[in-house]
């Protein structure tokens, strides 16, 4: 496939990655869906900045990232070190509440009011944000 | 109500060591990051170092960093920042600021407390 | 590191009258620009943060504008109270810096 070189249009270009943010909800399996239709996938926050920059763009609302614990460990959808990596908690989370009556406990994470995480039920129709890399072979044939 | 109060400060020669203290109340510690800022006398602010609310991330100026240490005790609501290798420029106004979870700004701020490096 | 360029440094001005603070990013940081005050002897106090977003008890006449990298607090109507010296700071990368601050004196 060939590179891209410049985002897609409605997607906003930061840092060498691209960014597309949803002003719909999906339950978190159909948001990491349509990402990946997209060429891309949920977002991974890897910094302080990217931390910042999303949360300038989404807002006080809830929003999917592409974090979930739903084989067992933490991890990022892009194969990003999840232990070693940047983490931004709300105090006390995550914590697999099983309170909430819906089954089963809390496994895709999602950024709150404030920008810091939470694990909430995946089922849960949030908006989302999608991320793809600039300079990575697209998906997409070369145009002859 | 929101306290914050620095101790720890006082005069030190060039090369040793200090450590500030900040006692905090009126809040949950435990939920909030935390700032240390430095003013040199007669000069503006100088952002010094941040940690999260448990410890989990730490970020330093550049002019401290490998020099000072921020860290918190969550069971005494107390924020530390250990400085070693102490320098002339270091002599400032030390305050801790407690951190604003959306926009990382210092929303609360101590008095301060004065550190000399001097011979 | 990201450089934070206040002006005026200083200032001699009347009660009453309108003030415009600047305060310039060396790259866009969005809208991650606060506002401080500070009294001599006294610890610094936020005023605005978020670029525009007064803090709960700060008088209307404080307002804040701007996002990217250039950004303004304007005081609307100088009190006796508002000499002082204020300082912007970004908080989008760290190392988190402050601008140099303005003076504000009485004229």
């Known amino acids: 496939g060939s590179e891209r070189t410049c985002c897609p249009v409605n997607w906003v270009e930061h840092e060498r990655s691209c960014y597309w943010f949803s002003r719909s909800g999906k339950a978190w399996a159909d948001a990491d869906n349509y990402c990946r239709l997209e060429d891309a996938h949920l977002v991974v926050v890897t910094s302080w900045e990217e931390q910042k920059f999303v949360q300038h763009h989404i807002g006080p609302v809830n929003t999917w990232m592409g974090l979930h614990d739903q084989n067992g460990p933490w991890k990022w959808v892009d194969g990003t070190d999840y232990e070693t990596g940047f983490k931004n908690w709300r105090p006390e989370q995550p914590d697999d509440w099983y309170g909430h009556g819906l089954g089963g406990g809390e496994d895709c994470a999602h950024f709150t009011d404030d920008g810091r995480w939470n694990d909430d039920v995946c089922q849960r129709p949030y908006r989302w944000v999608c991320e793809t890399e600039l300079d990575k072979a697209s998906q997409e044939p070369p145009l002859l | 109500q929101v306290q914050l109060v620095e101790s720890g400060g006082g005069v030190v020669q060039p090369g040793r060591s200090l450590r500030l203290s900040c006692a905090a109340s009126g809040f949950t510690f435990s939920s909030y990051g935390m700032h240390w800022v430095r003013q040199a006398p007669g000069k503006g602010l100088d952002w010094v170092a941040v940690?999260?609310?448990?410890?989990?991330?730490?970020y330093y100026a550049d002019s401290v960093k490998g020099r000072f240490t921020i860290s918190r005790d969550n069971s005494k609501n107390t924020l530390y920042l250990q400085m070693n290798s102490l320098r002339a420029e270091d002599t400032a106004v030390y305050y801790c600021?407690?951190?604003?979870?959306?926009?990382?700004?210092?929303?609360?701020w101590g008095q301060g407390t004065l550190v000399t490096v001097s011979s | 590191d990201i450089q934070m360029t206040q002006s005026p440094s200083s200032l001699s001005t009347s009660v009453g009258d309108r003030v415009t603070i600047t305060c310039r990013a060396s790259q866009s940081i969005f809208s991650y620009l606060h506002w401080y005050q500070q009294k001599p002897g006294k610890a610094p106090k936020l005023l605005i943060s978020a670029a525009s977003s007064l803090q709960s008890g700060v008088p209307s006449r404080f307002s804040g504008s701007g996002s990217g990298t250039d950004f303004t607090l304007t005081i609307s109507s100088l009190q006796p109270e508002d000499f002082a010296t204020f300082y912007c700071q970004q908080t989008y990368s760290p190392p988190l810096t402050f601008g140099g601050g303005t003076k504000v004196e009485i004229k």
């Open positions: 940690i999260w609310y448990d410890g989990s991330n730490k």
């Open positions: 600021a407690r951190d604003d979870p959306r926009s990382s700004a210092g929303d609360y």
